[in-house]
Amino acid sequence: DGCKDIFMKNEILSASQPFAFNCTFPPITSGEVSVTWYKNSSKIPVSKIIQSRIHQDETWILFLPMEWGDSGVYQCVIKGRDSCHRIHVNLTVFEKHWCDTSIGGLPNLSDEYKQILHLGKDDSLTCHLHFPKSCVLGPIKWYKDCNEIKGERFTVLETRLLVSNVSAEDRGNYACQAILTHSGKQYEVLNGITVSITERAGYGGSVPKIIYPKNHSIEVQLGTTLIVDCNVTDTKDNTNLRCWRVNNTLVDDYYDESKRIREGVETHVSFREHNLYTVNITFLEVKMEDYGLPFMCHAGVSTAYIILQLPAPDFR
């Protein structure tokens, strides 16, 4: 059928809660493409009816909720004008107790389930919640050893738990919980995270590679909405932070009042040897003051910027 096969690593998931997987492959899905999901080499595509427990939502496959029998290999076919790629995703579903972190002793857990805090530093844990726009996520609650976390050293900020002055006692088993609403129905999402503490300074030994942007300018009309992705490849065991900054300040902090420019939620795609991370920056409305300013994507020690510029006047 002329489609190129790409095999993703196994995803290990919890039964009885929602799960979504986005069929994105930046080199391919950046242009005009169609995406279709299939299960276990079936010729019949996954339903697009939003009332279906399993359905396709734009480029996503969405399980509301995941069930024991949903384990298997799912394919998403990405068709462009001149190309076709078939991405294979192996999903393994397991049962787990509400406050569990370890997934039945399964090895090779994704980095989302294993996170590192740096001793003596201010650091954070991330609750990885990857869902399409049709899913509305409520505030996140954090637990350690089955008890809700509280104390002045802990701050919940969107999908992160900020931990100030990390101590050795912060190691252990954490869980983050959110209520997801879709088509008027509510579901509980719960992710377990095993946290270890490292004394190593900085963020690991790997140097992430920023694929895009490439220190360039983008022509954009005044008043328009603009979304720019930062695509980063990094090792699977990395602990690098990825974010957008302007004037050496996180964009979410810099534009805290107006919220006109925001950082998106990070997503990633796992390959055998590395992870590909995407975190976007959204300009709800480009203003005059945005032109000529370097907006920096940071990934560990790596940086790359974009500069917005007004389109050249058209004298035709």
Epitope: S102, C146, E152, R153
Partner: antibody, heavy 116, light 107 residues
Amino acid sequence: QVQLVQSGAEVKKPGASVKVSCKASGYFFTSYWMNWVRQAPGQGLEWMGMIHPYDSETRYAQKFQGRVTMTVDKSTSTVYMELSSLRSEDTAVYYCASSTTAFAYWGQGTLVTVSS
Amino acid sequence: DIQMTQSPSSLSASVGDRVTITCRASQDIGNALNWLQQKPGKAPKRLIYATSSLDPGVPSRFSGSRSGTDYTLTISSLQPEDFATYYCLQYASSPYTFGQGTKVEIK
């Protein structure tokens, strides 16, 4: 390093109250729950309840509800467990145990003897 | 409340023996289970956290495992200092509950 130091042994009469203290050091006291566990002579371990020093939220085992009160003094990083209406079967060693990770550290124990 | 049924209540073994102690939970507790060791006149000491994570400084002859709601503490080769009482403790939901204890004695 983490240390939990408890107050000394007590002898009480039936009907009286006892207040045992547990002073914590070596970790962020207000970040983690503190548990109280007791052990009667020759018997097993029994969980009594816990308190979070950050906001003094308590959870008590049903068996001790109404008789036990756990309090905290943040200025001295000390947790207290008061048990009232003592009876002979309350004779036990009382332990505090920190849940930095679940029951990671234990105090040395305080022997409370209830005798007329 | 969650009941923890520990067996055996006591056992006699020799130095070098492999010893296995079991706890059964009356309902699902996931991996929220610790194993504690207590010697006479001393406070309990945690050996294993979250079913199978060995605490720092605890010899590798101790290990923990799980099958469903059955939890096992194994001492691969019993040493003289291992003669003590062992307790399991579930912390999945309060009230937290302990097993009745297993006294490991010298044969």
